[in-house]
């Protein structure tokens, strides 16, 4: 070895100065008698080396680097050797920081593994190999007096947590715990924790389960769920309180919390939920009343609330077949009595024969809003119910009685807009209990089965706005029947359009006769069309060559018209406008020329 480097310190604070010396022995005879020693840090040559010959003939160069700003670098002592640089010796320099105080030390007791897991934040990077040690001792009281030390816990490289196994733990007294960080530049210690491992238990949540239905137990009420939970066995001896959270599976509802709850529940009924709705439920627990950590939420349990029997009023209406009066067509509409009135699975129409106690004969069971059945000859009324898996609605009696009540008068209808019609009447005396309003397409498209109907519960009403199934340019038949206590009045009907169409085209004008100052015109009227209102009048327009216009209004029954006061030998443009309540349409233009003064009249 020709050369040797010595440094003031191989590891320094980042940015601190460092001094190095390189000595070249005299017996390196192949070197120049006065060799020039060069310094290199990493790949860069460093100026400032002070070289001297020592008394024993060796050469020494000393350099001071004012700031070591590399966290790791090689410092080399070199000589020029021909055209290349020959490295005689090199040392590794390290620079960094002493360890910061570890912070946020926290510990959790894992009851499953019976070990205490502590974690911390090591602080900023030191750029130097830094070791962490979790240190602890046993103590009575608040750790002011230090008892026997517990075996150090050394984390694996790069980890900021360490696990003290059960055999080194003290479960029946407090422990003082801290983290020590150490590197070449110094040592630091975290603030000390004083804890009973049981005070920092990491609880696991109970296991939620659905309750197995027992034959004796009553089923849950509508909007209720029956569930139970089993505590996490290792945590049974820790006083805890728990809370449940639930939300509907569908929709954007947020979690609702229920608590505090006991650690164990062999049977728990959760109510106030939406009926017939799927819910997600979770539970978690915390040590109580002493401080602790919440467990994680348990795995989800998914349960569906039972539904409630339908709570609806059923408005009914019926019709008899004209050819077979015992065949009845019954119609109904469910009207919710509450915001959540329950799902309707279907409807049953039934009849209870007199003298047969308890016997109920079903006449029809349907999911539709009407059914047709043969009414037994002795039956005067039937019962209608809506049902689902939870039960039935209150029965609605339907009494089949003849029309014996007074009729309403002055039934009339008028359009409100293209999709609604107002039907009005004068109520009879005495007031009815209500009205049934039916409407559907009038002739020629009329059909009994395609009628829409509504019940008006107010017997004092004098009209009703029809908004369903109304389309413009269609003729509607509207039937109104007053309803009384045990009977009804005769039905009245009226026809109306919600919007009529303007005439689609006006009749073609034809020239019948022409003279020098007059012209006789005629046309064939358009046949009436369904959905188009009748013509109210015609207007005939004529314009001369000087663009002067003239017109005359004619009644709707007109079939022709004579234009008088025309100029001889003049050109005229004539058209007919056919008008109704709904609008007007023009015919095509007829152009004619009156005769010259010398010409003879044409007939």
């Amino acid at each position: 070895e020709c050369g040797h480097i010595s440094v003031s310190a191989p590891i320094v604070h980042l940015g601190d100065p460092i001094t190095a010396s390189c000595i070249i022995k005299q017996n390196c005879s192949h070197l120049d008698p006065e060799p020039q020693i060069l310094w290199r840090l990493g790949a860069e040559l460093q100026p400032g080396g002070r070289q001297q010959r020592l008394s024993d003939g060796t050469q020494e160069s000393i350099i001071t680097l004012p700031h070591l700003n590399h966290t790791q670098a090689f410092l080399s002592c070199c000589l020029n050797w021909g055209n290349s640089l020959q490295i005689l010796d090199q040392v590794e320099l390290r620079a960094g920081y002493p360890p910061a105080i570890p912070h946020n030390l926290s510990c959790l007791m894992n009851l499953t593994t019976s070990s205490l897991i502590c974690q911390w934040e090591p602080g900023p990077e030191t750029h130097l190999p830094t070791s962490f040690t979790l240190k602890s001792f046993k103590s009575r009281g608040n750790c002011q007096t230090q008892g026997d030390s517990i075996l150090d816990c050394v984390p694996k490289d790069g980890q900021s947590h360490c696990c003290i196994p059960r055999k080194h733990l003290l479960l029946y007294q407090n422990m003082g715990i801290w983290v020590q960080a150490e590197n070449a530049l110094g040592t630091s210690m975290s603030p000390q924790l004083c804890l009973d491992p049981m005070d920092v238990v990491k609880l696991e949540p109970p296991m939620l389960r659905t309750m197995d239905p027992s034959p004796e137990a009553a089923p849950p009420q509508a909007g209720c769920l029956q569930l139970c939970w089993e505590p996490w066995q290792p945590g049974l001896h820790i006083n805890q309180k728990c809370e449940l959270r639930h939300k509907p599976q569908r929709g954007e509802a947020s979690w609702a919390l229920v608590g505090p709850l006991p650690l164990e529940a062999l049977q728990y009924e959760l109510c106030g939920l939406l009926p017939a709705t799927a819910y997600t439920l979770q539970i978690r627990c915390i040590r109580w009343p002493l401080p602790g950590h919440w467990s994680d939420w348990s795995p989800s349990l998914e349960l569906r609330t039972t539904e409630r029997a339908p709570t609806v009023r059923l408005d009914t209406w019926w019709r008899q077949r004209q050819l077979d009066p015992r065949t009845v067509q019954l119609f109904w509409k469910p009207v919710p009595l509450e915001e959540d009135s329950g799902r309707i699975q279907g409807y049953v129409v039934s009849w209870r024969p007199s003298g047969q106690a308890g016997a109920i004969l079903p006449l029809c069971n349907t999911t539709e809003l009407s059914c047709t059945f043969h009414l037994p000859s002795e039956a005067q009324e039937v019962a209608l119910v809506a049902y689902n898996s939870a039960g039935t609605s209150r029965p609605t009696p339907v009494v089949f009685s003849e029309s014996r009540g007074p009729a309403l008068t002055r039934l009339h209808a008028m359009a409100r807009d293209p999709h609604s019609l107002w039907v009005g009447w004068e109520p009879p005396n005495p007031w009815p209990q209500g009205y049934v309003i039916e409407w559907g397409l009038g002739p020629p498209s009329a059909s009994n089965s395609n009628k829409t109907w509504r019940m008006e519960q107010n017997g004092r009403a004098t009209g009703f706005l029809l908004k369903e199934n109304i389309r413009p340019f269609q003729l509607y038949e509207i039937i109104v029947t007053p309803l009384y206590q045990d009977t009804m009045g005769p039905s009245q009907h009226v026809y109306a359009y919600s919007q009529e169409m303007a005439p689609s085209h006006a009749p073609e004008l034809h020239l019948k006769h022409i003279g020098k100052t007059w012209a006789q015109l005629e046309w064939v009227p358009e046949p009436p069309e369904l959905g188009k209102s009748p013509l109210t009048h015609y207007t005939i327009f004529w314009t001369n060559a000087q663009n002067q216009s003239f017109s005359a209004i004619l009644n709707a029954s007109s079939r022709g018209f004579v234009l008088h006061g025309l100029e001889p030998a003049s050109l005229y443009h004539i058209h007919l406008m056919a008008a109704s309540q709904a609008g007007a349409t023009n015919s095509t233009v007829l152009t004619l020329m009156t005769l010259t003064p010398e010409g003879s009249e044409l007939h």
């Epitope: 059960r166 029946y172 007294q173 001896h237 006083n239 040590r287 002493l290």
Partner: antibody, heavy 118, light 107 residues
Framework: EVQLLESGGGLVQPGGSLRLSCAAS????????MGWVRQAPGKGLEWVSS????????PYADSVKGRFTISRDNSKNTLYLQMNSLRAEDTAVYYC???????????WGQGTLVTVSS | DIQMTQSPSSLSASVGDRVTITCRAS??????LNWYQQKPGKAPKLLIY???NLQNGVPSRFSGSGSGTDFTLTISSLQPEDFATYYC?????????FGGGTKVEIK
């Protein structure tokens, strides 16, 4: 000198309740776990329940879980055992014990007899 | 819960005999095993804690050994005052279960 003195035992009918007390002296009560152990006539020792120094940890034997409640009042240096829904098989001498730092029952009271009979 | 099984349930011995009682835990409990002595009509008394540590005031003829699941209490030379019932107890976990007891009687 450590002393533990139980009281509150006696005769009670099945389904009835009793509350046992254990007055402690001679040591810093609030720093130590405490426990109850019972011994039925002619039988071995049966651990009943223990309680941590702060009162937050209260394990019970399966045979008494849900019926017995252990508690402590550190200001009065007293340990309690509330016994409800008593059964004939709960008849025993009940001992109170002070636990050491490794869970050993270092000191015991003289015991109090509980008899459950109709 | 950890179950403790003691054997034998009783034994007869003479003064001066060496007596061995064993205790087995249903799962590993490290060294958290304690031994008690009880004489008729008296409260139990702690003899040995943490498997092998003699409680203050207990004669040195009593010794304990073992770790994990198998433990032994040995009385090296039985004395007249040692005729009693001996119990083991675990303190590894909080359900501080006792063994069924071993009654040492005079032969």
């Amino acid at each position: 000198e450590v002393q533990l003195l139980e009281s509150g035992g006696g005769l009670v009918q099945p389904g009835g309740s009793l509350r046992l007390s254990c007055a402690a002296s001679g040591f810093t009560f609030s720093l130590y776990w405490m426990g109850w152990v019972r011994q039925a006539p002619g039988k071995g020792l049966e651990w009943v329940s223990s309680i941590s120094s702060s009162g937050g940890v209260t394990p019970y034997a399966d045979s008494v879980k849900g019926r017995f409640t252990i508690s402590r009042d550190n200001s009065k240096n007293t340990l309690y055992l509330q016994m409800n829904s008593l059964r004939a098989e709960d008849t025993a001498v009940y001992y109170c014990a002070k636990l050491g730092e490794l869970g050993q029952m270092m000191y015991w009271g003289q015991g109090t007899l509980v008899t459950v009979s109709s | 819960d950890i179950q403790m099984t003691q054997s034998p349930s009783s034994l007869s011995a003479s003064v001066g005999d060496r007596v061995t009682i064993t205790c087995r835990a249903s799962q590993g409990i490290s060294s958290y095993l304690n031994w008690y002595q009880q004489k008729p009509g008296k409260a139990p008394k702690l003899l040995i804690y943490y498997a092998s540590n003699l409680q203050n005031g207990v004669p040195s003829r009593f010794s304990g050994s073992g770790s994990g699941t198998d433990f032994t209490l040995t009385i090296s030379s039985l004395q007249p005052e040692d005729f009693a019932t001996y119990y083991c107890q675990q303190s590894w976990m909080y359900a501080h279960m006792f063994g069924g007891g071993t009654k040492v009687e005079i032969k």
